[in-house]
Amino acid sequence: QQQTLPKPFIWAEPHFMVPKEKQVTICCQGNYGAVEYQLHFEGSLFAVDRPKPPERINKVQFYIPDMNSRMAGQYSCIYRVGELWSEPSNLLDLVVTEMYDTPTLSVHPGPEVISGEKVTFYCRLDTATSMFLLLKEGRSSHVQRGYGKVQAEFPLGPVTTAHRGTYRCFGSYNNHAWSFPSEPVKLLVTGDIENTSLAPEDPTFPADTWGTYLLTTETGLQKDHALWDHTAQNLLR
């Protein structure tokens, strides 16, 4: 006899990286017929939602109108059908950005490189932080962690055309509080013609959408989005 229901999916819209004072919605998708959803923050009950009618709803939303450092952290959700509770969802790391200062980002040997050359990004922030994050825009967003007193190095190794794209870095004051993003650095990787044509660039989006730090393109299936979010957050951890 089944003791628990399958775990729900949890994700943040528009994204798990939220500029301070901006709004975010935490979504929890369970099963049709769920009579109660609970959102937990840092291990404690944070909010409850009881969908009506439960048989026609399989997703609830918890709205945060004004993001701040106190709201940043790890969220999970569970749901109940009758008396039976689900397994808890994966953890959602909700990050507040635009805290304090703006780092600078430079790339070595330069923004235009040849396939096979080794590339290193350098991120610098003079205020008190020792952890840095390098993010590449695009659907398959890459997140790297680096450490240093005022700057960190992010070696990419010998690059291919798959590395081309736009990069930004953040200083991290703790796991869930990040600085403003650096100015973007666009890495252009040239190779022989055959290689270039076989390596499509990550999907991109209009520059103005970076304001909400959407590292994915348009959300397709919610489950895909949730899985992607979880993958990116695992990289952060």
Epitope: T104, L105, S106, H108, P109, G110, V113, I114, S115, G116, E117, K118, T120, Y122, R124, Q151, P155, G157, P158
Partner: antibody, heavy 115, light 107 residues
Framework: QVQLQQPGAELVKPGASVKLSCKAS????????MNWVKQRPGQGLEWIGM????????NYNEKFKSQATLTVDKSSSTAYMQLSSLTSEDSAVYYC????????WGQGTTLTVSS | DIQMTQSPSSLSASLGERVTLTCRAS??????LNWLQQEPDGTIKRLIY???SLDSGVPKRFSGSRSGSDYSLTISSLESEDFVDYYC?????????FGSGTKLEIK
């Protein structure tokens, strides 16, 4: 055309400091790394460090970290390297070289440390 | 630090001869390797970047190649102005390091 102008020679006393300059022209100064390289008489080349004028990000060879300080003056498109606590071992030619790929080189400054 | 072992340290050759200089990298540097030429007056000029890309204005008799961790500079037919010093430089990983140099002398 790209040019990196360095003074021909500097003479300083042991224990003193010196600030070597490298004036860039013919390109956007803030867009490229600037490297500094040392060559002792009759010897090979040694990389000291580099600075990115746009971000002030620096990277030093550990060997020179305590002695060399790299800075830039964007208004005059000039890169500087200050060397402190000089000894006769620091007598060498010092080159600046543009870009992470070292594409253009200055003519070098001959530093003589002598009492 | 990455060691760049350059050979030979000196080479005597004749005008019109084909010569090859080699640098071996102690760690993976990808294609992040330059070949530099230094004149007797100290002037340094880059000939090859990214292992095999020829700088503009450099004669086509110069070429660069790679086999594993061995990087080569070949001069297909020596001319009088080629009898100077040559260095390899890896810019893959800091501290960036140079080979010890090859002195090319006329036979």
């Amino acid at each position: 055309q790209v040019q990196l102008q360095q003074p021909g020679a500097e003479l300083v006393k042991p224990g003193a400091s010196v600030k070597l300059s490298c004036k860039a022209s013919g390109y956007t100064f803030t867009s490229y790394w600037m490297n500094w390289v040392k060559q002792r008489p009759g010897q090979g080349l040694e990389w000291i460090g580099m600075i990115h004028p746009n971000s002030d990000i620096t990277n030093y060879n550990e060997k020179f970290k305590s002695q060399a300080t790299l800075t830039v003056d964007k208004s005059s498109s000039t890169a500087y390297m200050q060397l402190s606590s000089l000894t006769s071992e620091d007598s060498a030619v010092y080159y600046c070289a543009r870009h992470g790929r070292f594409d253009y080189w200055g003519q070098g400054t001959t530093l003589t440390v002598s009492s | 630090d990455i060691q760049m072992t350059q050979s030979p340290s000196s080479l005597s050759a004749s005008l019109g001869e084909r010569v090859t200089l080699t640098c071996r990298a102690s760690q993976d540097i990808g294609s992040s390797l330059n070949w530099l030429q230094q004149e007797p007056d100290g002037t340094i000029k880059r000939l090859i970047y990214a292992t095999s890309s020829l700088d503009s204005g450099v004669p086509k008799r110069f070429s660069g190649s790679r086999s594993g961790s061995d990087y080569s500079l070949t001069i297909s037919s020596l001319e009088s102005e080629d009898f100077v010093d040559y260095y390899c430089l890896q810019y893959a990983s800091s501290p960036f390091t140079f080979g010890s140099g090859t002195k090319l002398e006329i036979k």
